[in-house]
């Protein structure tokens, strides 16, 4: 599931969110990983047009870092997940109402885009920044 490679982000939609020249993980389960992941963001981005001004920037940051995860290069390139605390902040602080709607849409398969079911991250399954500060990405 986590087969892929590290590359500089060269897309458009997450330009304002991801660090300039960020190394991101591109998942080779897709035929064209850069395009596939960019398209997933686009699909979800359109949903974010209707969320509150408080939620939107937080949700965009979470979404971009969830789909274009930071990449740790090495013999086996590894995606670095978002830190649990940042995910929970978006879920419970900035986007509490919207999160419920997004979860509901996920369960009903409304985010299905061909082969990929775009789901909101499960915060509880993400590593905590208190366990190992290098094991997760901070937004």
């Amino acid at each position: 599931d986590n087969k892929g490679y590290c590359a500089q982000y060269r897309g458009e939609v997450c330009n304002a969110v991801l660090a300039k020249d960020a190394l991101v993980f591109l998942n080779t389960s897709y035929a064209d990983p850069e395009e596939a992941q960019e398209l997933l963001v686009h699909t979800a981005w359109n949903e974010l047009k209707v969320v509150s001004p408080v939620c939107r920037p937080a949700a965009e940051a979470l979404l971009c870092n969830h789909i274009f995860q930071e990449c740790s290069p090495g013999v086996v390139p590894t995606p670095i997940p978002i830190c649990r605390e940042y995910c929970l902040a978006v879920k419970e602080l900035f986007c509490a109402k919207e999160w419920l709607v997004m979860e509901e849409k996920t369960h009903r398969g409304l985010y299905r885009s061909e082969m990929h079911l775009l789901s909101v991250p499960e915060c509880s399954k993400l590593p905590s920044m208190h366990w190992d500060p290098t094991a997760c990405a901070r937004l």
Partner: antibody, heavy 119, light 112 residues
Framework: EVQLVESGGGLVQPGGSLRLSCAAS????????LNWVRQAPGKGLEWVSY????????DYADSVKGRFTISRDNAKNSLYLQMNSLRDEDTAVYYC????????????WGQGTLVTVSS | DIVMTQSPLSLPVTPGEPASISCRSS???????????LDWYLQKPGQSPQLLIY???NRASGVPDRFSGSGSGTDFTLKINRVEAEDVGVYYC?????????FGQGTKLEIK
């Protein structure tokens, strides 16, 4: 609804030039690789060229390398094929086709535009 | 380049009968991600090609379930379990693993 509409075909003399266009609508154009595929009269399908979304990577069939140039304008939702030094064997219907980034398949095709190279 | 070889090149079929087309590639189309990058297309008379099967065995949206794809590596098969008059046309396999993407010669299915 996804739509791809080719234009620019016509009759041209050997050695001449032609520029094909493909106008796209109904999908997030900038997130797809796009291809040109051609079909000579009564023959099979031959892939010609592709261009990636925003990364600028592209490739050509050996038969057109150095003569054809693929390009795109994401702001205009348009794909182009500049064809120079045309030969008789370039006579074909040229299709533009969208490649699914998830599966790699050419999941939508235009209706095609006929290019005839003849003196 | 990967060479795609289809057989038969002509396939006369009686309506209601099954049909089968074979496609062989000169090298494996199985990617390290577990997918076979092999598609099947149908070009009906006077029309553009349309996608039937992707990744070897997945039916494209709107394709009737009488069509099925199977195979892995270098050997693939398209089956139509009960041919209908509207299925006439030329069937092509295509490898989408690497450029240049290459097509089989095509199989012309006609009604007997």
């Amino acid at each position: 609804e996804v739509q791809l509409v080719e234009s620019g075909g016509g009759l041209v003399q050997p050695g001449g030039s032609l520029r094909l266009s493909c106008a796209a609508s109904g999908f997030t154009f900038s997130s797809y690789r796009l291809n040109w595929v051609r079909q000579a009269p009564g023959k099979g399908l031959e892939w010609v060229s592709y261009i990636s979304s925003s990364t600028g990577s592209l490739d050509y069939a050996d038969s057109v390398k150095g003569r054809f140039t693929i390009s795109r304008d994401n702001a205009k939702n348009s794909l182009y094929l500049q064809m120079n030094s045309l030969r008789d064997e370039d006579t074909a219907v040229y299709y533009c086709a969208r490649r699914s980034p998830y599966t790699g398949s050419l999941d939508n095709w235009g209706q095609g535009t006929l290019v005839t190279v003849s003196s | 380049d990967i060479v795609m070889t289809q057989s038969p090149l002509s396939l006369p079929v009686t309506p209601g009968e099954p049909a089968s087309i074979s496609c062989r590639s000169s090298q494996s189309l199985l990617h390290s991600n577990g997918y076979n990058y092999l598609d099947w297309y149908l070009q009906k008379p006077g029309q553009s090609p349309q996608l039937l099967i992707y990744l070897g065995s997945n039916r494209a949206s709107g394709v009737p379930d009488r069509f099925s794809g199977s195979g892995s590596g270098t050997d693939f098969t398209l089956k139509i379990n009960r041919v209908e008059a509207e299925d006439v046309g030329v069937y092509y396999c295509m490898q989408a693993l690497q450029t240049p993407y290459t097509f089989g010669q095509g199989t012309k299915l006609e009604i007997k």
